[in-house]
Amino acid sequence: HTVELNNMFGQIQSPGYPDSYPSDSEVTWNITVPDGFRIKLYFMHFNLESSYLCEYDYVKVETEDQVLATFCGRETTDTEQTPGQEVVLSPGSFMSITFRSDFSNEERFTGFDAHYMAVDVDECKEREDEELSCDHYCHNYIGGYYCSCRFGYILHTDNRTCRVECSDNLFTQRTGVITSPDFPNPYPKSSECLYTIELEEGFMVNLQFEDIFDIEDHPEVPCPYDYIKIKVGPKVLGPFCGEKAPEPISTQSHSVLILFHSDNSGENRGWRLSYRAAGNECPELQPPVHGKIEPSQAKYFFKDQVLVSCDTGYKVLKDNVEMDTFQIECLKDGTWSNKIPTCKIVDCRAPGELEHGLITFSTRNNLTTYKSEIKYSCQEPYYKMLNNNTGIYTCSAQGVWMNKVLGRSLPTCLPECGQPSRSLPSLVKRIIGGRNAEPGLFPWQALIVVEDTSRVPNDKWFGSGALLSASWILTAAHVLRSQRRDTTVIPVSKEHVTVYLGLHDVRDKSGAVNSSAARVVLHPDFNIQNYNHDIALVQLQEPVPLGPHVMPVCLPRLEPEGPAPHMLGLVAGWGISNPNVTVDEIISSGTRTLSDVLQYVKLPVVPHAECKTSYESRSGNYSVTENMFCAGYYEGGKDTCLGDSGGAFVIFDDLSQRWVVQGLVSWGGPEECGSKQVYGVYTKVSNYVDWVWEQMGLPQSVVEPQVER
């Protein structure tokens, strides 16, 4: 009889075991285990009748189509075999064990005791057949195995071979190299590769196979396994395989498809091809006069581009438009996209106008082309070029006038300062105790008129100032402080300020320049209680033209000591000139006591200690600070007075040979102007040089040489 066994392990014993088995008995055990397992059989006890070639009693182990072993007896002899320690392994998942005893047994034989178990098959080690083994990596597990692929490969649907995804390769460059995947290593199996060469219309693709060409083939059938096909429009070239590469192919098309197919077997190294675009040839090019073309080639084909440029100092001219370079291109029909342009000499055109300056041409015919030269100069004697610049500009290759120091920036004509058009007389007679000034003697002198219409009734007063540049007036802060009913420092509105320059006689303003204010700047620390920091600036709405009657005064060097004691200075103004009029009378009578003609006086600087002492001896707050100095005579008689406020106290600087503003008329008192031992007090300008330059928006270093020349 037959016993079916499906367990993963078990025990098989001869009938009656451990007693002797009966005669004339036959039992078959069919053992089946799952796929991926084999069966291992071994015997713990074996005692059968011995016979030649096991003819009588035996145990036969077999598979469906193969006898694995036949055992009998007790000991192995030449003609009979006992299992002993031997293990029987089935090749597959099925094993059949048959026990047979004949009709007679001369002795009692105890039979056998066998055990079986399912054991895992290591398919990775045992698969020799290429058709069944993994292409790249094999992974065994109990009851089975699986395959995997190297990086960049994909497992085929057969779960065994490794293919690549190579159906999406687009080539758009004019030249390139295409290879089979992994070249020169063997190409992957089960793959369909598609390579597209897509160039611009007008190009034609030429193919050339190189180096190794090795695609699996067949001796009789053309390329049944692996192959290359080349598709050009509707036409298909190939298939190609074997070890002989195809001849170079001229496709006559700008669009080419290369198909490469591999089946699931074989180890071939693949292929490599280079492609290049061919196009129509364009005519030879001649560079323009004073120019060149790049790149310079013997031949130019479709899509080649050349850049036309000109020598230094020349510009490309195309259709009356100037440019630095011009590009032309070889077209698909073999013509150039444009004619070669010409090279035209750079023209800097008419140079920019220089404010307060002139231009002279150094080159004949007033040429403005490349390397031409011009010279800027300032309107002397009223303006001088900043930093003593040469003023020489050359027409550069870029088409701009260039100066070695300033580059493309124009020079600056700064107003000359401290040089009156007529010399001040050395002898000044004994403003109070002064004398009439000749026109042009104090060209920096400004009359500042303030008409405060925000007050009821309208307030009107005047003061003096000093021209520092074409746009700025220096004066005392108290002149430009709103004459309020309290001691708050608030500047007057710029709308209420008018400045007169070049004025000699206040009755005749026709020859004077009058200007409104763009800004009124009081020193931020101006103190109304003691007139400390009594300094201010007015920026004019428009720069004033300089001339013999309108010229700036120079600012001093930054020196805290201020003017040296006993130095003589000049001060001018339209203030009270009559020593018999009292200050109270002036205050009550408004502007009627103004002097018609500009007056001036020569006064010595008073030692600081002497001045301080003279004021400290008075009752009231008469402090003379380090930001002030005094000038005048002990005996009186000559002084500045009300209405001269803000005017410049100028001293001649021997070093620079210029007049420098050292002081601004600030205050005095309490006695009448010109009284004995009542010195005029002036703002010490040298303490404020930095502040002045800062407000005017010029760094001091730029203009310092004004008083150093």
Partner: antibody, heavy 114, light 112 residues
């Protein structure tokens, strides 16, 4: 013509704050200062502070400098006086004046009562 | 701080008579540079804001009748109403503007 129009009367609890407005017209607001003065019922005038709209400069009476805040909005030509931590003795009419006291607002009565 | 003291606290004057109010400051209000005394006089009628009469101690505000005059310098100042009118009944204040602002306590002027 020049006019200063103040906001209406306010009743506040002790500890609260009050903000009085003063809208100017008829002159250039930024060219002059605004003063604030108060007058308690039956009492004299007491200066609070001063503001200059052109640059937001302020000056305060020491008595009020920790509690009063003066501000301006030049876009609407309006000045403001805010008084914080109110107490009953802050009950007063609050005036604004401009152009150096030539023009005055009509006054705003602020009553501080619990 | 500058302290301002007015005298008398109240004053009764017959119509057409002169009325004089004094004001004393704790320090000089004369600025030696501008040569001005920073003192002003105000008139306040019931329910109205103050009205500026005099500034710089003696300058009359525009539109103020010339019966009002101011005098004094330094620390002592006077407001004079040369001929009292019925409409002059009010409280008068002096104010210093030399250093910030301080008002006097006020002087009440009535008709006798």
């Amino acid at each position: 013509q020049v006019q200063l129009v103040q906001s209406g009367a306010e009743v506040k609890k002790p500890g609260a704050s009050v903000k009085v407005s003063c809208k100017a017209s008829g002159y250039t607001f930024t060219t002059d200062d605004i003063n604030w003065v108060r007058q308690a019922p039956g009492q004299g005038l007491e200066w609070i502070g001063w503001i200059y709209p052109r640059d937001d400069r302020t000056k305060y009476n020491d008595k009020f400098k920790d509690r009063a805040t003066l501000t301006v909005d030049t876009s609407s030509n309006t000045a403001y006086m805010e008084l914080s931590s109110l107490r009953s003795e802050d009950t007063a009419v609050y005036y604004c004046s401009s152009l150096e006291d030539t023009y005055w607002g009509q006054g705003t009565l602020v009553t501080v009562s619990s | 701080d500058i302290v301002m003291t007015q005298s008398p606290d109240s004053l009764a004057v017959s119509l057409g008579e002169r009325a004089t109010i004094n004001c004393k400051s704790s320090q000089s209000l004369l600025n030696t540079r501008t040569r001005k005394n920073y003192l002003a006089w105000y008139q306040q009628k019931p329910g109205q804001p103050p009205k500026l009469l005099i500034y710089w101690a003696s300058t009359r505000e525009s539109g103020v009748p010339d019966r009002f005059s101011g005098s004094g310098s330094g620390t002592d100042f006077t407001l004079t109403i040369s001929s009292l009118q019925a409409e002059d009944v009010a409280v008068y204040y002096c104010k210093q503007s030399y250093n910030l602002y301080t008002f006097g306590q006020g002087t009440k002027v009535e008709i006798k």
